[in-house]
Interface confidence: low
């Protein structure tokens, strides 16, 4: 028997420095977790103690904090090289800055293979990107070889900016021939490493013949055997065992997100490459694990540029940006409109001639807007200003909801109106009329939404049974501020870009902004 230790991360999302327990900015260092300096300590400890170790990443290193905003992927290459990752799969967020934003800072700089079998380049890009990412890689580990085959969510064109010269194929269809190729090369230990979410990970384990282990990402799935060590609730045991169509037991793993845990899986193979046993658990990277001093020193050096960045001008406003709770928790506020407009703008993807865009709607809890921005400071808007408006370090995500769920959400928005509570919704691509003289649960008297399947966007009444795409904060997607109906009834959820980054990019693009209060949210009395 031959034993392999797989160490894995996924959806790190730019958390190079240690973070708080909820993966936001570290405040009380004695309680902080994760970060590459702490990860390196643990990885080195395991590498010294165990003979056959692979360190793998299942994608979405990009996007999530000011580190990515400033360094644009160079930080990912630098610190992943420093940690000596063995392989990485491409995630959807690796395309956030377009193909160029992937090629230059990461693909050309990484000293480890970057993989995806289901992304095919065409046209002029094919020669430019050739060899910079691979469908699979055979890695020598001790006296053996292990094949790693990569995959990426086929939804990436809707979630990021891969351009028109990359085709995202069905994962299972694309993986099978690559695995077969590995088999012909006498590679009998094969890991599928990819970024399509836990449901697809399980399907790959079930359907792709010859895959021994699946290491996934995208869905931020936390798996754990026994008592979990922090706040995350396990979606199942670690590893999650799937019985394949040809009768094999295939371990599937994922390690939550944000570098909070290091996935730790021990696999025992027989001489024919069959998995005999698999066990392990994610390791919580808490403050009991010291940060490696050399990596920490490097982090501190890279930080200097970040501190400068946060005070630089992104753009100007010529109007007061009203982000006060007195406005945003009671009525339409222009800060809410600005943020929602930025959220929609960030999700412009012309992927189908029938649609002007795949999504037109935004909702945003008023309680998530934490500060106004005064235009009388020469109109200057900085990252620091935006960090006061959006201090939670969240993301703006894409969900699919039925019209009936949206209706419930808007009823919840005003169910206790007048108490300055955070659930009052700011909107984009939506016109809502409330009648507060009616009883809670029956206060939405008009709800019109902007069409997507149209050449000239216009507002149509919400249809209860139709499925709509909506951009919203991850806080709402997770049921925050009492929006349990969103969490319970959403049909799909893909995590998006860092909130501040979305707004800062929009302001930089627009250069001068002047958002207005324009009748997106109205109040009426009596019959409508």
């Amino acid at each position: 028997a031959w034993e392999l230790t797989i160490l894995h991360t996924n959806d790190v999302h730019s958390r190079l420095e240690q973070t708080s327990e909820d993966s936001s900015k570290c405040v009380n260092a004695s309680r902080c977790m994760g970060g590459v300096a702490r990860l390196f300590t643990k990885v080195q400890q395991i590498r010294r103690a165990e003979p056959n170790v692979l360190l793998l990443d299942a994608g979405d290193q990009y996007q999530g904090t000011i580190w990515f905003t400033v360094y644009k992927g160079a930080e990912v290459a630098h610190f992943m090289n420093a940690l000596r990752y063995d392989a990485m799969a491409l995630g959807n967020h690796e395309f956030d800055n377009g193909v160029e934003g992937l090629i230059e800072p990461l693909l050309k700089e990484a000293k480890f293979p970057i993989l995806s079998a289901n992304i095919k380049a065409k046209g002029p890009l094919a020669s430019q990107i050739s060899g910079l990412y691979l469908p699979y890689k055979v890695l020598p580990v001790g006296d053996e070889v292990v094949g790693i085959v990569g995959y990426t969510s086929k939804e990436t064109p809707f979630l990021s900016n891969p351009g028109t010269n990359l085709v995202f194929e069905d994962e299972i269809t694309a993986l099978q021939p690559e695995v077969d190729k590995l088999k012909t090369l006498n590679v009998n230990k094969i890991i599928a490493l990819g970024h399509s979410g836990f449901e697809m990970d399980k399907l790959i384990a079930q359907k792709v013949r010859g895959v021994d282990v699946v290491v996934g990402g995208h869905s931020n799935t936390f798996l754990y055997t026994g008592n979990p060590p922090s706040k995350e609730v396990p979606a199942g045991k670690y590893p999650f065992i799937v019985t394949s169509d040809d009768g094999r037991k295939v371990p599937v793993v994922q390690a939550y997100a944000f570098g909070k845990y290091l996935g730790y899986l021990k696999i025992e193979f027989d001489e024919r490459g069959n998995v005999i046993s698999s066990h392990g658990n994610p390791i919580l990277l808490n403050s009991s694990i010291p940060e490696d001093p050399s990596i920490k020193a490097d982090i501190n050096k890279w930080r200097i540029k970040l501190d400068n960045y946060s005070t630089q001008e992104l753009g100007k406003t010529i109007v007061y940006l009203d982000g006060s709770s007195q406005s945003c928790r009671f009525r339409e506020c222009n800060m809410g409109n600005l943020i929602c407009d930025a959220m929609i703008n960030n999700n412009l993807r012309h992927t189908d001639e029938m649609f002007w865009n795949h999504v037109s709607m935004c909702i945003l809890n008023g309680g998530g807007i934490r500060s106004p921005i005064d235009e009388r400071n020469n109109g200057t808007i900085t990252w620091e200003n935006l960090a006061a408006v959006l201090p939670f370090g969240g993301t703006f995500d894409l969900v699919q909801l039925k019209g009936s769920t949206l209706k419930k959400a808007f009823e919840h928005s005003v169910h206790r109106y007048g108490q300055s509570t955070g659930e009052f919704l700011q909107v984009g691509g939506i016109h809502v009329v409330y009648d507060l003289s009616r009883k809670p649960g029956d206060r939405v008297v008009k709800l019109d939404v902007l069409c997507t399947k149209c050449r000239v966007p216009s507002y149509d009444p919400l249809k209860m049974d139709e499925v709509y795409k909506v951009i919203l904060p991850n806080f709402l997607a997770n049921g925050g501020d009492g929006f349990q109906m969103i969490k319970d009834e959403l049909l799909r959820h893909d995590s998006g870009d860092q909130d501040i980054n979305v707004v800062s990019t929009y302001i930089s693009k627009m250069k001068v902004i002047y958002p207005a209060v324009e009748g997106r949210i109205k109040f009426s009395t009596g019959s409508h």
Epitope: D22, S371, A387
Partner: antibody, heavy 122, light 111 residues
Framework: QVQLQQPGAELVKPGASVKMSCKAS????????ITWVKQRPGQGLEWIGD????????NYNEKFKTKATLTVDTSSSTAYMQLSSLTSEDSAVYYC???????????????WGQGTLVTVSS | DIVLTQSPASLAVSLGQRATISCRAS??????????MHWYQQKPGQPPKLLIY???NLESGVPTRFSGSGSGTDFTLNIHPVEEEDAATYYC?????????FGSGTKLEIK
């Protein structure tokens, strides 16, 4: 609803130890820090330390490092504080409290037990 | 450790008037858009009760006559209009860094 139940009183002799309990209900015990606070009669509040039940991770006020030991039993959702080498200075009401901080790291103490009155007397 | 200085130590306010309690920290307790300062009310024989968290956020179920403000090192708790049942001792507490200390308390008496 969230509740933290503490025994009303403990009478202990000088030099002895006491282990007081704090039984939590109405929320996920392993997901929130439990803080312990001391209040001497007619005096203010002193932060002793806290414990994260999910991992057993603890933080102590330097002043109480050798005096207090914080533990938890997750199976019964109970937090414990043991005070050792008791003197009259340790006579006080000891509160356990649940820290908030699910969506932000505010760590405000949103629910409190009724307190245990510890009297050190021979 | 961060020292929190509360003033006044006690005050007497007429029914319906405004009570203002101040809390000064020896070090900045604000960062990343948050002020890590909280206010509690304690009545004799009872445990403290959270009123305000993160400087200005009203805890659920607390009457709106209580409000908090401030950032950096200076924070204020306001009660207006004061009611009979507000007679109590009020404490500020920070959670910016360990250990999380409390202020010495302000006793409010209703005239």
């Amino acid at each position: 609803q969230v509740q933290l139940q503490q025994p009303g009183a403990e009478l202990v002799k000088p030099g002895a130890s006491v282990k007081m309990s704090c039984k939590a209900s109405g929320y996920t015990f392993t997901s929130y820090w439990i803080t312990w606070v001391k209040q001497r009669p007619g005096q203010g509040l002193e932060w002793i330390g806290d414990i994260y039940p999910g991992s057993g991770n603890t933080n102590y006020n330097e002043k109480f490092k050798t005096k207090a030991t914080l533990t938890v039993d997750t199976s019964s959702s109970t937090a414990y504080m043991q005070l050792s080498s008791l003197t009259s200075e340790d006579s006080a009401v000891y509160y356990c409290a649940k820290e908030g901080g699910l969506t932000t790291e505010d760590y405000a103490l949103d629910y409190w037990g009724q307190g245990t009155l510890v009297t050190v007397s021979s | 450790d961060i020292v929190l200085t509360q003033s006044p130590a006690s005050l007497a306010v007429s029914l319906g008037q405004r009570a203002t309690i101040s809390c000064r920290a020896s070090k900045n307790v604000s960062t990343s858009g948050y002020s890590y300062m909280h206010w509690y009310q304690q009545k004799p024989g009872q445990p403290p009760k959270l009123l305000i968290y993160l400087a200005s956020n009203l805890e659920s179920g607390v009457p709106t006559r209580f409000s908090g403000s401030g950032s950096g090192t200076d924070f204020t708790l306001n009660i207006h209009p004061v009611e009979e049942e507000d007679a109590a001792t009020y404490y500020c507490q920070h959670s910016r860094e360990l250990p999380f200390t409390f202020g010495s308390g302000t006793k409010l008496e209703i005239k």
